[in-house]
Interface confidence: low
């Protein structure tokens, strides 16, 4: 996976004169149809409810800092998180919860109950995802909380736990 | 969440002359790369299998009417619905079903069985989602049916039950 | 569902002169904001872990061959697969696994355990999805493996089992 550098912002587009001059193909390629995206996998060692991510994933027009994706360009973003759980069932049912936070506020959550019979199966796999479509401003943070982070399987499934955002429509 | 007004349709773009004149940035900003989207949360009180939605969500290039999203611009749309259920388990298993309808026809459904052990438990959470990629014409309606609508948790999770569409590629 | 032919590649855009001449609307419509997408439903009869798909679905800028989607234009793709399972529960729990493969390498998988109570029930429904955001080169293949393909319900739910890709950002 590669980390893309952030291209020039729309302000730098030499729409008239400059390098592009009258070359429409050049102009169109540098037009203000901004794209921003991120696709990060969960960190190997989790020790708190706020999840950490591997910053060496795909980052383009989005920064990663202290468990947060930090938005660089304002607009309407599609945000999606998917987690793979592996639960050693105790004697009671377990509620798995995934919370998507914008600027530390819970905006959306998904819950699934596993081990519901109260009977012990050695392992129960569960996959949980959550998406959100929201307007995000510059420096908005996106993060994920999971109460039962100990059940996130980072060893067997290091690639399965991801947080992704992409800009659908910019604010221009 | 804000409701965006629908911008001028491509027909109104003064590509030569008019306000934009020779200003390529203006032309590009108003170019026919149409974006349309919606993101609505379920209504607080559900009383029938066809779900109702809060019309004060995000609507841009899409109308809401009587439980339906109504398409304004033709093209290829990505449609996604996600619902959060909270089931008081009876003595038998329960099948949760989410149906996506286009013009009242079921185009895609998702089913999950909960309470499978047949044991009465306090509650079981289940999250169910369904997506669809389809060509939609002007005035096409998008709606959602859920037989077991009584289990959709609109009180604890008012933000979790959403219907969203966005135009991926217009028909131009 | 219709199959779209692939439009002219960007190299063919007559940006100056040619058919478009000075018509900016024409130029913009043929600009290099490439879109590619596919949305295929699973084949009726499955007989191996690598799933087959109905090639008469939506294909635009992507080819289908021998169970693979074959990428025609390089770029960042959003890939999503959703499957509907119907399991006749045996005496033990069953792990349902969906694997997304890029060039035959497993890039992402989703697992869910059903029939966890160990009790024989008539049937259990389970819906499983997996997404991926990845840079794909020309001729890259995208495919899906399911060990328990016998549980994919192609008769009751012929429309529910889909593999979809769409280009989010091209390599220009």
């Amino acid at each position: 996976q590669r980390t893309d550098s952030i291209p020039n912002s729309p302000d730098n587009i030499p729409l008239r004169g400059g390098n592009c001059s009258e070359d429409l193909l050049c102009i169109l390629k540098r037009a203000p149809f901004k794209k921003s995206w991120a696709y990060l996998q969960v960190a190997k060692h989790l020790n708190k409810t706020k999840l950490s991510w591997n910053k060496d994933g795909i980052l383009h027009g989005v920064r990663y800092q202290d468990g947060n994706l930090v938005i660089q360009f304002p607009g309407l973003y599609f945000i999606i998180c998917q987690l793979q759980f592996l639960v050693q069932c105790p004697n009671n049912s377990v509620d798995l919860k995934l919370e998507l936070l914008i600027n530390k506020h819970i905006k959306k959550q998904a819950l699934v109950t596993v081990c519901e019979s109260g009977m012990q199966t050695k392992h129960v796999y569960q996959n949980l995802s959550q998406f959100l479509l929201d307007y995000l401003q510059v420096n908005t943070t996106v993060s994920v909380n999971v109460d039962t982070f100990q059940y996130i399987d980072t060893s067997t499934f290091p690639l399965e736990n991801v947080l992704s955002v992409f800009l659908y429509s910019n604010s221009d | 969440q804000r409701t965006d007004s629908i911008p001028n349709s491509p027909d109104n773009i003064p590509l030569r002359g008019g306000n934009c004149s020779e200003d390529l940035l203006c032309i590009l900003k108003r170019a026919p790369f149409k974006k349309s989207w919606a993101y609505l949360q379920v209504a607080k009180h559900l009383n029938k299998t066809k779900l109702s939605w809060n019309k004060d969500g995000i609507l841009h290039g899409v109308r809401y009417q009587d439980g339906n999203l109504v398409i304004q611009f033709p093209g290829l749309y990505f449609i996604i619905c996600q619902l959060q259920f909270l089931v008081q388990c009876p003595n038998n298993s329960v099948d949760l079903k989410l149906e996506l309808l286009i013009n009242k026809h079921i185009k895609k459904q998702a089913l999950v069985t909960v309470c499978e052990s047949g044991m009465q438990t306090k509650h079981v959470y289940q999250n169910l989602s369904q997506f669809l990629l389809d060509y939609l014409q002007v005035n096409t309606t998008v709606s959602v049916n859920v037989d077991t609508f009584q289990y959709i948790d609109t009180s604890t999770f008012p933000l979790e039950n959403v219907l969203s569409v966005f135009l991926y590629s217009n028909s131009d | 569902q219709r199959t779209d032919s692939i439009p002219n590649s960007p190299d063919n855009i007559p940006l100056r002169g040619g058919n478009c001449s000075e018509d900016l609307l024409c130029i913009l419509k043929r600009a290099p904001f490439k879109k590619s997408w596919a949305y295929l439903q699973v084949a009726k009869h499955l007989n191996k872990t690598k799933l087959s798909w109905n090639k008469d679905g939506i294909l635009h800028g992507v080819r289908y061959q021998d169970g693979n989607l074959v990428i025609q234009f390089p770029g960042l793709y959003f890939i999503i697969c959703q499957l509907q399972f119907l399991v006749q529960c045996p005496n033990n729990s069953v792990d349902l696994k969906l694997e997304l493969l890029i060039n035959k390498h497993i890039k992402k998988q989703a697992l869910v355990t059903v029939c966890e109570s160990g009790m024989q029930t008539k049937h259990v429904y389970q819906n499983l999805s997996q997404f991926l955001l990845d840079y794909l080169q020309v001729n890259t293949t995208v495919s899906v493996n399911v060990d328990t393909f016998q549980y994919i319900d192609t008769s009751t739910f012929p429309l529910e089992n889909v593999l979809s890709v769409f280009l989010y950002s091209n390599s220009d």
Epitope: Q88, G118, Q120, K122 | - | N91
Partner: antibody, heavy 115, light 107 residues
């Protein structure tokens, strides 16, 4: 420390019913599975079945028609009944707690089937 | 029923030796496999659960590994108290089934 103790007659006549009780001490019977396992002299181990504290049972199909396992949570006990016994049922019978595997065992009791 | 085939059925070794015992399942059992040690006249004792997890109080010279159908119990350095019979158990599917046992004797 959880301890299990089997009790019951050491000699049973053919065609009669073998009855054993396992008493759990040092912990509650609630919340766990409780199994019976047997081992014929000089041979390997065979799982007979288990009971969940709620009363849910699972039996080995090879013995299912003859086995009944029951639980008495008030006494912290569970019991095994095996009907229509033959000499092939002669074995050391163990009770065990089934959590991830059989983590606590009784010391075992030898039951001989003979006339 | 799932068949559990243990090998070897008997094994002679010396104190300090590294010993491996294998168990093969007739079908995939995920990691639902345990290893037990039994000494004459005693109840079996759990050593390893869930394929590779060391039971509390069991010396770290015991370890388990596996792949879904093939599993191994390893004793890194045999001690005098380790001479006993070892059994594997699958509890993935009903009925639970044990291997036939491996008798570890002093050479």
């Amino acid at each position: 420390q959880v301890q299990l103790q089997e009790s019951g007659p050491g000699l049973v006549k053919p065609s009669e019913t073998l009855s054993l009780t396992c008493t759990v001490s040092g912990g509650s019977i609630s919340g766990y599975y409780w199994s019976w396992i047997r081992q014929p002299p000089g041979k390997g181990l065979e799982w007979i079945g288990y009971i969940f504290y709620s009363g849910y049972t699972k039996y080995n199909p090879s013995l299912k028609s003859r086995v009944t396992i029951s639980v008495d949570t008030s006494k912290n006990q569970f019991s095994l009944k095996l009907s229509s016994v033959t000499a092939a049922d002669t074995a050391v019978y163990y009770c065990a707690r089934d959590r991830w595997d059989f983590d606590y065992w009784g010391q075992g009791t030898l039951v001989t089937v003979s006339s | 029923a799932i068949q559990m085939t243990q090998s070897p059925s008997s094994l002679s070794a010396s104190v300090g030796d590294r010993v491996t015992i294998t168990c093969r399942a007739s079908q995939g059992i995920r990691n639902n496999l345990g290893w037990y040690q039994q000494k004459p006249g005693k109840a079996p004792k759990l050593l390893i659960y869930a394929e590779s997890s060391l039971q509390s109080g069991v010396p770290s010279r015991f370890s388990g590994s596996g792949s879904g159908t093939d599993f191994t119990l390893t004793i890194s350095s045999l001690q005098p108290e380790d001479f006993a019979t070892y059994y594997c158990l699958q509890d993935f599917n009903y009925p639970y089934t044990f291997g036939q046992g491996t008798k570890l004797e002093i050479k």
